[in-house]
């Protein structure tokens, strides 16, 4: 057992059927020795009477929040959760497996740039009596500090007969290095409280490995004098690090057709224009990289040709 | 919101069998834990047994070990009780229900409720 935070208390529980439970002993905050009762929840059955109360935790029925009284007054409340082990595995019963980009992939995070900023998100199909509580660091064992904000409700959406909700946190790293070579990884640590159960999910990353740079802006065509052919020419988005000379980004120029099953033409230059061939009710679409490591791309900022 | 209907309820002999069924609609029926309660004329809703949500791991009370078995098919939204060797004092009202925690005998762990199903055994 231990304390999640100010009287309340987290119960590991390694469970199969007819397992022994976990013996827990609960002691009530008080410097009254007699006359003191204790009830679980809105209960008013008394379980037990005593400064201390030994419970064995073999289920949530077992978890709540016990209060010990005296005399019809209140003294103080311990709120048991359970974070529960099955077959050896850590519940993950909160969060939903987004699956990529592999398999039990629960935090997905991203960055624009190299500042020490960055954005985690994760889904659930829970609605409600849910909670997350988000910290961060850089290393584990001589941590340097990250400061994340509060997790906050992003998006819903409906899939299949399911809604879905998407929650993300923003994170600072606290003494970033934009032009450092990394070489301890984030940590990411986000504790789930879902009514009475506790979960802790877990995410390890380099900045450079989470970068997704905003769309390049500004995105423009000026048509060739007697030519089918256009200028495109964009800016590096806002949002990217400074300067560019350094934090330099790589762009695809698309051309696409109306129709999916059109040809694509594609182009990979490292300026910020190329020419290329406009076609009727085609359109131009322009995405960027980081030019020296593979991350990922960024979305793509489009234009029609017309 | 989750909508569940029991069926399968009746009167048998006691030593014989039954199975009850409890059937979803609503939303996706795979998020929930699933269980089985039962309250006879004069007493508490007592716990029966419940599934966990993908239908690996099973949990009973003392009192139907042996003789009772959950099962569920998350393809067709449906739990099943499977009652065997009943005797006279598994007769009650048998309610389904679904939840978020797994396991817990503790009926207000369970969010939704079917409206229930009699199992009568005679002696």
């Known amino acids: 057992i231990w304390e999640l935070k100010k009287d309340v208390y987290v119960v590991e529980l390694d469970w199969y059927p007819d397992a022994p439970g976990e013996m827990v002993v609960l002691t009530c905050d008080t410097p009254e020795e007699d006359g003191i009762t204790w009830t679980l929840d809105q209960s008013s059955e008394v379980l037990g009477s005593g400064k201390t109360l030994t419970i064995q935790v073999k289920e949530f029925g077992d978890a709540g929040q016990y209060t010990c009284h005296k005399g019809g007054e209140v003294l103080s409340h311990s709120l048991l959760l359970l974070h529960k082990k099955e077959d050896g595995i850590w519940s993950t019963d909160i969060l939903k497996d987004q699956k990529e980009p592999k398999n039990k992939t629960f935090l997905r995070c991203e960055a624009k740039n190299y500042s020490g900023r960055f954005t985690c998100w994760w889904l659930t199909t829970i609605s409600t009596d849910l909670t997350f509580s988000v910290k961060s660091s850089r290393g584990s064992s001589d941590p340097q500090g990250v400061t994340c904000g509060a997790a906050t409700l992003s998006a819903e959406r409906v899939r299949g007969d399911n809604k879905e909700y998407e929650y993300s946190v923003e994170c600072q790293e606290d003494s970033a290095c934009p032009a450092a070579e990394e070489s301890l990884p984030i940590e990411v640590m986000v504790d789930a409280v879902h009514k009475l159960k506790y979960e802790n999910y877990t995410s390890s990353f380099f900045i450079r490995d989470i970068i997704k740079p905003d769309p390049p802006k500004n995105l423009q065509l000026k048509p060739l004098k007697n030519s089918r052919q256009v200028e495109v020419s964009w800016e590096y988005p806002d949002t990217w690090s400074t300067p560019h000379s350094y934090f330099s980004l790589t762009f695809c120029v698309q051309v696409q057709g109306k129709s999916k099953r059109e040809k694509k033409d594609r182009v990979f230059t490292d300026k910020t224009s190329a020419t290329v061939i406009c076609r009727k009710n085609a359109s131009i679409s322009v995405r960027a990289q980081d030019r020296y490591y593979s991350s990922s791309w960024s979305e793509w900022a489009s234009v029609p040709c017309s | 919101e989750v909508q569940l209907v029991e069926s399968g309820g009746g009167v048998v002999q006691a030593g014989e069998s039954l199975r009850l069924s409890c059937a979803a609609s609503g939303r996706s029926f795979s998020n929930y834990e699933m269980g089985w309660f039962r309250q006879a004329p004069g007493t508490e809703r007592e716990f029966v047994g419940s599934i966990n949500r993908r239908g690996s791991s099973t949990y009973y009370a003392d009192s139907v070990k042996g003789r009772f078995t959950i099962s569920r098919d998350n393809a067709k939204n449906t739990v099943y009780l499977q009652m065997s060797s009943l005797k006279p004092e598994d007769t009650a009202v048998y309610y389904c229900?679904?939840?978020?925690?797994?396991?817990?005998?503790?009926?207000?762990?369970?969010?939704?409720w079917g409206q229930g199903t009699q199992v009568t055994v005679s002696s």
């Open positions: 229900a679904a939840g978020w925690l797994y396991p817990s005998s503790r009926s207000r762990d369970y969010d939704y």
